[in-house]
Interface confidence: low
Amino acid sequence: SSSPTSSASSFSSSAPFLASAVSAQPPLPDQCPALCECSEAARTVKCVNRNLTEVPTDLPAYVRNLFLTGNQLAVLPAGAFARRPPLAELAALNLSGSRLDEVRAGAFEHLPSLRQLDLSHNPLADLSPFAFSGSNASVSAPSPLVELILNHIVPPEDERQNRSFEGMVVAALLAGRALQGLRRLELASNHFLYLPRDVLAQLPSLRHLDLSNNSLVSLTYVSFRNLTHLESLHLEDNALKVLHNGTLAELQGLPHIRVFLDNNPWVCDCHMADMVTWLKETEVVQGKDRLTCAYPEKMRNRVLLELNSADLDCDPILPPSLQTS
């Protein structure tokens, strides 16, 4: 790779509002922001672990891959990457681990080729509903994004502003139906307790969905029916107790699906019968032979595939006359 070059000018220390304005000066052909490394041959700019507090204004127009990881950006304002001429080739933007806690509406506007965005490992207390759509119209222009990586973006509990984190993220995913072309969505490690019911129906192009290492208890209200292209569904390390008939049927109906269910606290009582029957027949669950019961105590560590209907009982419900208050 070509050796890194740096511009002679010092890194912009202009007021934050200037970062959201479209830079009027076209960068010099070989200009590279201070504190960054640039390779025109590889169309790559890396500004990594530099404690940057704002996006450099003098990014070269050739940039296709931009790494801004390990910085202290805090806020991504509207038009954070808007430039004259525009960064027309920017296809992959990695902002992981840059202490972002706010991403504003239109933060990624004027990036017509942006296909992959990684915001992982940022404590996003305030993700605008219009962060990805750029507009509050009911139907926005389609986003070019095909891969959106949002692993571990949950902020500390005391920074969540008393609102549903799941709802905030989903609002950003659904706004303006801009992400209809999204193929990969990673939402691992976000403490999600539930998945809002309409989210998947509006992401029909998904091939890969990673919800691992969350706290999902149930998929009862989640529909997978529209996701005919879905190839992998990662649900490892959640709090799932059982999958009900509707979910099982929908998963079975997806032509290319592989489902990953390891490390969930399966409850092996009478409600588990349908899932056990399905597991014995289906080919879609990867590693199904290692799924084990967590509850009730007498069933702990039993392998789901080895259970039969006699194993799956429910304690009888006491008649009202015998119930204690």
């Epitope: 296709r64 992959a92 992959q116």
Partner: antibody, heavy 121, light 107 residues
Framework: EVQLLESGGGLVQPGGSLRLSCAAS????????MSWVRQAPGKGLEWVSA????????YYADSVKGRFTISRDNSKNTLYLQMNSLRAEDTAVYYC??????????????WGQGTLVTVSS | DIQMTQSPSSLSASVGDRVTITCRAS??????LNWYQQKPGKAPKLLIY???SLQSGVPSRFSGSGSGTDFTLTISSLQPEDFATYYC?????????FGQGTKLEIK
């Protein structure tokens, strides 16, 4: 049918450069991370580099960092490895492989047949 | 970097034997461990992924177990075609290191 076909190997002098290519077919290329793995003669497998589906994230083994560059052209379904400042210890068969999986685990489910790179004066 | 240590480095066994190969990680890698088989002059082949999932098309005599730092590949009854070199690989860290390999030879 998934197929991966490496090319670009050959004999090169120490300090020289080489670019390997891996032509992919039979799957939705841009939806999968890809990787290069090498094997020196008579030795074990060494993971070299990986790249995410859209090319936005790249990773390198310490032994090649700063000398090798992984990239991909999704419009051509092709993975590349640009190797500069080559050393004798870079002599190996280089395999390209497809990643499958998620955030916490991934695996290489399809491999090419390999291309031999020999660094010698 | 996460280091992977395989043992033994070589092993002689007979057809029909039960064989166990172990792999130890220098830190916890949860279940992000894969096993590959390689025969001379050929590309590696995925056997087991995510510690214990059998790759499609791989015979059921192969099995994997373990999580955290200690993992095992077991071949329940060796067949002639199983004599090869076996590698573990972790994919938990950003650098996806392999073990040094275990060569399984005919006794």
């Amino acid at each position: 049918e998934v197929q991966l076909l490496e090319s670009g190997g050959g004999l090169v002098q120490p300090g020289g450069s080489l670019r390997l290519s891996c032509a992919a077919s039979g799957f939705d290329f841009e939806s999968y991370a890809m990787s290069w793995v090498r094997q020196a003669p008579g030795k074990g497998l060494e993971w070299v580099s990986a790249i995410s589906g859209s090319g936005g994230s790249t990773y390198y083994a310490d032994s090649v960092k700063g000398r090798f560059t992984i990239s991909r052209d999704n419009s051509k379904n092709t993975l590349y490895l640009q190797m500069n400042s080559l050393r004798a210890e870079d002599t190996a068969v280089y395999y390209c492989a497809r990643y499958y999986g998620g955030y916490y685990s991934a695996w290489m489910d399809y491999w090419g047949q390999g291309t031999l790179v020999t660094v010698s004066s | 970097d996460i280091q992977m240590t395989q043992s033994p480095s070589s092993l002689s066994a007979s057809v029909g034997d039960r064989v166990t190969i172990t792999c130890r990680a220098s830190q916890s890698i949860r279940s992000a461990l894969n096993w590959y088989q390689q025969k001379p002059g050929k590309a590696p082949k995925l056997l087991i992924y995510a510690a214990s999932s059998l790759q499609s098309g791989v015979p059921s005599r192969f099995s994997g177990s373990g999580s955290g730092t200690d993992f095992t590949l077991t071949i329940s009854s060796l067949q002639p075609e199983d004599f090869a070199t076996y590698y573990c690989q972790q994919t938990y860290g950003y650098l996806h290191t392999f073990g040094q390999g275990t060569k399984l030879e005919i006794k």
